[in-house]
């Protein structure tokens, strides 16, 4: 069986998926749903998952949610929030994805894959 995916490959694939869901949109991402903004710092994969997991019925981000869970060491369920959330700001999923994508690109360029 294939071995574990290298962190660099996993991060690149997450970036590619985020780019993919923003391309050629015919309708607003997740119907314009709002999510909590997060601090893009240590532990942000879990924080991003905690925020996005509360969006239901949005098939466009299901793969992203699965991929984020691979970066998060603990199980995340809807309604769960860590201290990493800026719990006073809600933004559209489309904007959340832009913020996350930019941060991940910077991590990838800097060689910070974990």
């Amino acid at each position: 069986s294939p071995g574990p995916v290298p962190p660099s490959t996993a991060l690149r694939e997450l970036i590619e998926e985020l780019v993919n869901i923003t391309q050629n949109q015919k309708a607003p991402l997740c119907n314009g749903s709002m999510v909590w903004s997060i601090n893009l710092t240590a532990g942000m994969y879990c924080a991003a998952l905690e925020s996005l997991i509360n969006v239901s019925g949005c098939s466009a981000i299901e793969k992203t949610q699965r991929m984020l869970s691979g970066f998060c060491p603990h199980k995340v369920s809807a309604g769960q929030f860590s201290s990493l959330h800026v719990r006073d700001t809600k933004i559209e999923v489309a904007q959340f994805v832009k913020d996350l994508l930019l941060h991940l690109k910077k991590l990838f360029r800097e060689g910070r894959f974990n």
Epitope: L18, V19, T22, Q23, Q25, K26, A27, P28, L29, G32, E92, A94, Q95, V97, K98, D99, L101, L102, K105, K106, R109
Partner: antibody, heavy 118, light 109 residues
Framework: QVQLQESGPGLVKPSETLSLTCSVS????????WSWIRQPAGKGLEWIGR???????NYNSSLKSRVTMSIDTSKNQLSLKLSFMTAADTAVYYC????????????WGQGTLVTVSS | SYVLTQPPSVSVAPGQTARITCGGN??????VHWYQQKPGQAPVLVVY???DRPSGIPERFSGSNSGNTATLTISRVEAGDEADYYC????????????FGGGTKLTVV
């Protein structure tokens, strides 16, 4: 290919309200953020604000009290209203599409010149 | 408010490399986008998210961003590259907004 076309009066009197429309063709207006940006002759670009299909807006704080943006998804059009116009508002006004994956602008209209004069 | 500072002008000979800077407080933490604008035309995106190129933009255009300075580099400059260049960032704060640099006139001498 996405195309943006601004339209509106070329001349506005001082203290009046400017109304501009941006018609989008070749793509859906519903799935992107849209901005208005202006450029006085011989000067740099100034961001006016942005709007999403939900109607949510962000405005330049220096213009906030005078700006209203709206979106009509059925007509694939955006509109900009800027009140209490002065000579300092004379500029080329552009509408632009924010990229889906970043905060950059990947499509721009050709711009429309608005002159404020009595 | 957030300010982006660009040199008003940069001159370069054909075939040489032009570097246009964009300074801002901790700009390295932001995504920087660069536009080329020729007289009488709308701006055209040439680099986004620091160093990515839109399709159709030559590889001669590249970008970097760290610390307090972002840089647009144009290698093997051609006469057709003469234009105004603007940097732009999105400032995510309590008051979300877009900021443009003042622009740099690139002259090919």
């Amino acid at each position: 290919q996405v195309q943006l076309q601004e339209s509106g009066p070329g001349l506005v009197k001082p203290s009046e309200t400017l109304s501009l429309t941006c018609s989008v063709s070749g793509g859906s207006i519903s799935s992107y953020y849209w901005s208005w940006i202006r450029q006085p002759a011989g000067k740099g670009l100034e961001w006016i604000g942005r709007i999403y299909m939900t109607g949510r807006t962000n405005y330049n704080s220096s213009l906030k009290s005078r700006v209203t943006m709206s979106i009509d998804t059925s007509k694939n059009q955006l509109s900009l209203k800027l009140s209490f116009m002065t000579a300092a508002d004379t500029a080329v006004y552009y509408c632009a599409r924010e990229s889906g994956s970043s905060y950059s602008y990947d499509y721009w209209g050709q711009g429309t010149l608005v002159t404020v004069s009595s | 408010s957030y300010v982006l500072t660009q040199p008003p002008s940069v001159s370069v000979a054909p075939g040489q490399t032009a570097r246009i800077t964009c300074g801002g407080n901790n700009i390295g933490s932001k995504g920087v986008h660069w536009y080329q604008q020729k007289p009488g035309q709308a701006p055209v995106l040439v680099v986004y998210d620091d160093s990515d190129r839109p399709s159709g933009i030559p590889e001669r255009f590249s970008g970097s961003n760290s610390g307090n300075t972002a840089t647009l580099t144009i290698s093997r400059v051609e006469a057709g590259d003469e234009a105004d260049y603007y940097c732009q960032v999105w400032v995510s704060s309590s008051d979300h907004h877009v900021v443009f640099g003042g622009g740099t006139k690139l002259t090919v001498v």
